[in-house]
């Protein structure tokens, strides 16, 4: 209708990076920019994804290098994290959120794909990381090894081998394990502190240089107390699980201190593993009963999990695996469940800014049934798995509904702000839920809409539209881009209109009758009034139309609803040669060229396109006759 197709601004970028996958218009004190997501962008050797800022009129795009943002205290894996897969602008302060839903971090032998987002302030500076699903690893441990180095230990090389082998089993690194070693006899010394080394390689190297210090006495209680009061303090981390491994070959010469030492260790929640080396006893034919009782006393309860004994120093190698396994019996999932909570949540797959924070879709949460998390300045709200049961019953829990594939919100005059999330794989047909979130981690689900067709991906795109700009949502549009019709993936957009408290189905938007795949409804954008009739409008993308070149459809708002026939269809081929997947993302909230008209930004594979609005001239014709 009034979008100019003759002089678009086509901003080029990397196709392999999928520059254009997401687009957002951005205003900084009157300067207009496009923010463009490139989720496959490379940074160094890693395909992290990134975000570009592109000047609207002329000039080149600049990479924001958000892919270089690192989280401290985690062993992160940023390769393929898909930064820029979702973008959400906060019009209040012109900040925006760029998400990396496949950001993962190492936890023991697993990588947990919790996802994370970067908040960027209005002048394109990174301000903070948002990662509500990030939990401490179960391997967030401070381990202090308490080595008996008294004269009776022989040969020391076997103790060293044991030490090196057990260290090789530890997941040492930021957010995971730290190891410190103390050696005792008559006195106790730090061989190295918890925070001295940050990798297995470095710790093993340090351990290989530990020499036996000797001593005629074995002050085990002293060694344990030193570890508790000193070693865990120097470089110890708040909240880390404290683990002590005591290795000794004989009864202590300060056993009357053990009761108090162990009480204090218990008070400090130190889990103690104790290894009795019976070489000295066996070489001399001494009954080790008293010694074994003492080591069992040192070990945390139950003994069968925390106490080990070996025939001699050389046999230490035989318990490496068992000791490692017991220390990491926590590893895997919480409470040894076989299911995942937020470990694979992919938070930030979708994002949406609300008044008090941001909603983040987490499609992988709760075994890929999905969830919606909320991050606010006051903290985070993570609804419990049970909160969703009303609409996502237990019997379908293994279906992977992908709730959170998209998130938005609506405003009704009765209920105020209500959140909306799509689950395009629910029971194969897809579902959309409208809900409110509570700080006690529960939800109230007000309404649910279900898709009609298996595999249509109903709910993979949702947009709320306030047609008349009164602050109350009038229309909710739900995309089912894989809707199969007439032998092709044609796509469908469902229209729901607000009637009192509920959204009532009111038909679908019309697309064109081409006989190729289109995926109409892959993107749906509520845009500000394009045709200057004071009603806000809607643009729908069909990125597979025209043999994957893509097209967009403009629908005009009118009197609290949406006109279901498009007023303008713009195909990629009209704009420039070689455009592909045009319409994969759309944003239209700003006047980019200062002509008083709202302009459109549209993403394509390797391109971002700006379409300028043209003024609409209203001609009021009147006839009057003379003579009358």
């Amino acid at each position: 209708f009034n979008m100019d197709t003759r002089k678009p601004r086509v901003i080029p970028g990397s196709r392999t990076a999928f520059f254009g996958y997401t687009v957002q218009q951005h205003d900084i004190s009157g300067n207009k920019w496009l923010v463009v997501g490139a989720p496959l962008e490379t940074n160094g050797y890693q395909k992290t994804g990134d975000v570009y800022k592109c000047p609207v009129i002329h000039g080149n795009c600049t990479k924001l290098n958000l892919g270089r943002v690192t989280l401290s205290n985690v062993s992160e894996r940023k390769d393929n994290m898909r930064l820029g897969l979702s973008l959400a602008t906060n019009p209040k302060d012109n900040s925006f959120l760029a998400c990396s839903p496949l950001w993962s971090h190492e936890c023991g032998s697993s990588y947990y794909t919790t996802g994370m987002c970067s908040r960027v302030n209005s002048n394109f500076r990174f301000s903070k990381t948002v990662a509500p699903a990030l939990q401490r690893c179960q391997t967030y441990m401070d381990i202090v090894i308490v080595l008996d180095g008294s004269n009776s230990i022989y040969p020391w090389v076997e103790v060293q081998h044991f030490l090196i082998n057990i260290l090789k089993k530890f997941y040492i690194g930021p957010g995971q394990i730290q190891v410190g070693v103390v050696q005792y006899g008559e006195d106790v010394v730090h061989e190295f502190h918890l925070n001295d080394y940050r990798s297995v390689k470095d710790v093993v190297e340090a351990a290989s240089h530990i020499e036996q210090r000797g001593g005629t006495e074995t002050r085990t209680a002293f060694g344990i107390e030193f570890a508790r009061s000193e070693a865990f303090q120097k470089g110890g981390r708040k909240g880390a699980k404290k683990v002590m491994i005591v290795i000794t070959d004989g009864e202590s010469h300060d056993s009357p201190d053990l009761e108090k030492v162990i009480q204090q260790s218990e008070r400090d929640n130190v889990t103690r593993y104790a290894v009795a080396v019976l070489g000295y006893y066996n070489r001399r034919g001494i009954n080790p009963e008293t010694f074994l009782n003492e080591i069992k006393y040192i070990a945390s309860d139950p003994d069968d999990k925390h106490f080990f004994n070996v025939t001699d120093e050389a046999a230490l190698k035989d318990i490496v695996d068992a000791l490692g396994d017991r220390i990491f019996s926590l590893e895997g999932t919480n409470k040894n469940e076989t299911s995942f909570g937020l470990e694979m949540s992919q938070t930030g797959f979708s994002s949406h800014v609300v008044e008090d924070g941001v909603l983040l879709g987490a499609v992988g949460a709760y075994d890929w049934n999905g969830a919606v998390l909320k991050e606010t300045s006051a903290g985070k709200v993570i609804p419990l798995r049970e909160s969703y049961l009303k609409e996502f019953p237990e019997e379908l829990k293994n279906h992977g509904a992908y709730l959170g594939y998209t998130v938005t919100s609506v405003v009704s005059s009765r209920q105020g702000r209500v959140y909306v999330a799509g689950a395009p794989r629910f029971n194969h047909t897809g579902k959309v839920i409208l809900f409110t979130m509570h700080n006690n981690r529960s939800l109230t689900i007000h309404q649910a809409m279900r898709g009609q067709q298996i595999g249509s991906y109903f709910g993979s795109e949702i947009t709320s539209v306030d047609i008349d700009g009164d602050g109350v949502t009038d229309v909710l549009l739900v995309g089912a881009p894989m809707y199969f019709n007439e032998g092709r993936e044609r796509g469908k957009v469902y229209v729901y209109e607000l009637r009192q408290n509920l959204f009532v189905y009111n038909g679908t938007l019309k697309d064109s009758h081409s006989y190729q795949n289109a995926r109409f409804g892959s993107s749906i954008a509520s845009v500000r009034d394009l045709n200057q009739d004071s009603y806000n409008d809607v643009v729908v993308g069909a990125p597979l139309e025209d043999n994957h070149a893509g097209a967009i459809y403009i629908f005009h708002g009118f009197r609290g609803s949406i006109l279901k026939t498009p007023k303008q269809r713009i195909t990629a081929s009209e704009l420039a040669t070689g455009l592909q997947y045009f319409g994969c993302s759309i944003h239209g909230q700003l006047d980019l060229n200062e002509d008083g008209l709202i302009d459109l930004a549209v993403g394509a594979l390797g391109n971002a396109v700006i379409l300028w609005s043209r003024p609409v001239v209203q001609i009021n014709a009147s006839l009057h006759f003379e003579p009358s």
Partner: antibody, heavy 120, light 109 residues
């Protein structure tokens, strides 16, 4: 030769204080534990308190808890028993004794004792 | 707290007699039980440690044994110098809390 010598006993009024010393020789106090044991006239042995010289952990009998304090100065190789708020029933001969691992946690050496009399 | 009940509180015996003194612990304890001999006006002397180990310099007529929670001191052939008071003592495991029995006075018959 291992030796323990107590001193500091005497006559004290009820409510008064007294400090007993136990000077050790022939061994290092740092490596062992010192116990104080008392014996009221014509009665049996009653354990009073103990200290681990190197860790300073202390234990007390309920009858003296809060009134008596055991301590050790390893540089002087001497242990002490500070007795406050003395009562008539604290009248006894006070022995210090060594407690260590080589005698499997038995009191292998004792001092000759020092008499404490609490009377008005 | 563990109590040590010593019996008998006194006994009369003749030189050459076999004498047995028993201590019963109020609950299961480790073998850290010792026996002491005390003569009037003197400090106690260690005889037996670890329930059955003879302390150096102590005559072999003294022996100790254990049966469950019962600990026994035996003098196989009483000598004139053995007339004294005998005490058992138990050490609480892994602390330096100790308890004495009430004592057994061995007198000349």
């Amino acid at each position: 030769e291992v030796q323990l010598v107590e001193s500091g006993g005497g006559l004290v009024q009820p409510g008064g204080s007294l400090r007993l010393s136990c000077a050790a020789s022939g061994f290092n106090l740092y490596s062992s534990y010192i116990h104080w044991v008392r014996q009221a006239p014509g009665k049996g042995l009653e354990w009073v308190a103990s200290i681990s010289s190197h860790s300073s952990y202390t234990y007390y009998a309920d009858s003296v808890k809060g009134r008596f304090t055991i301590s050790a100065d390893t540089s002087k190789n001497t242990a002490y028993l500070q007795m406050n708020s003395l009562r008539a029933e604290d009248t006894a001969v006070y022995y210090c004794a060594r407690y260590w691992y080589q005698s499997a946690w038995a009191l292998d050496y004792w001092g000759q004792g020092t008499l404490v009399t609490v009377s008005s | 707290d563990i109590q040590m009940t010593q019996s008998p509180s006194s006994l009369s015996a003749s030189v050459g007699d076999r004498v047995t003194i028993t201590c019963r612990a109020s609950q299961s304890v480790s073998s850290a039980v010792a026996w002491y001999q005390q003569k009037p006006g003197k400090a106690p002397k260690l005889l037996i440690y670890s329930a059955s180990s003879l302390y150096s310099g102590v005559p072999s007529r003294f022996s100790g044994s254990r049966s469950g929670t019962d600990f026994t001191l035996t003098i196989s052939s009483l000598q004139p110098e053995d007339f004294a008071t005998y005490y058992c003592q138990q050490s609480a495991p892994y602390s330096s809390l100790i308890t004495f029995g009430q004592g057994t006075k061995v007198e000349i018959k």
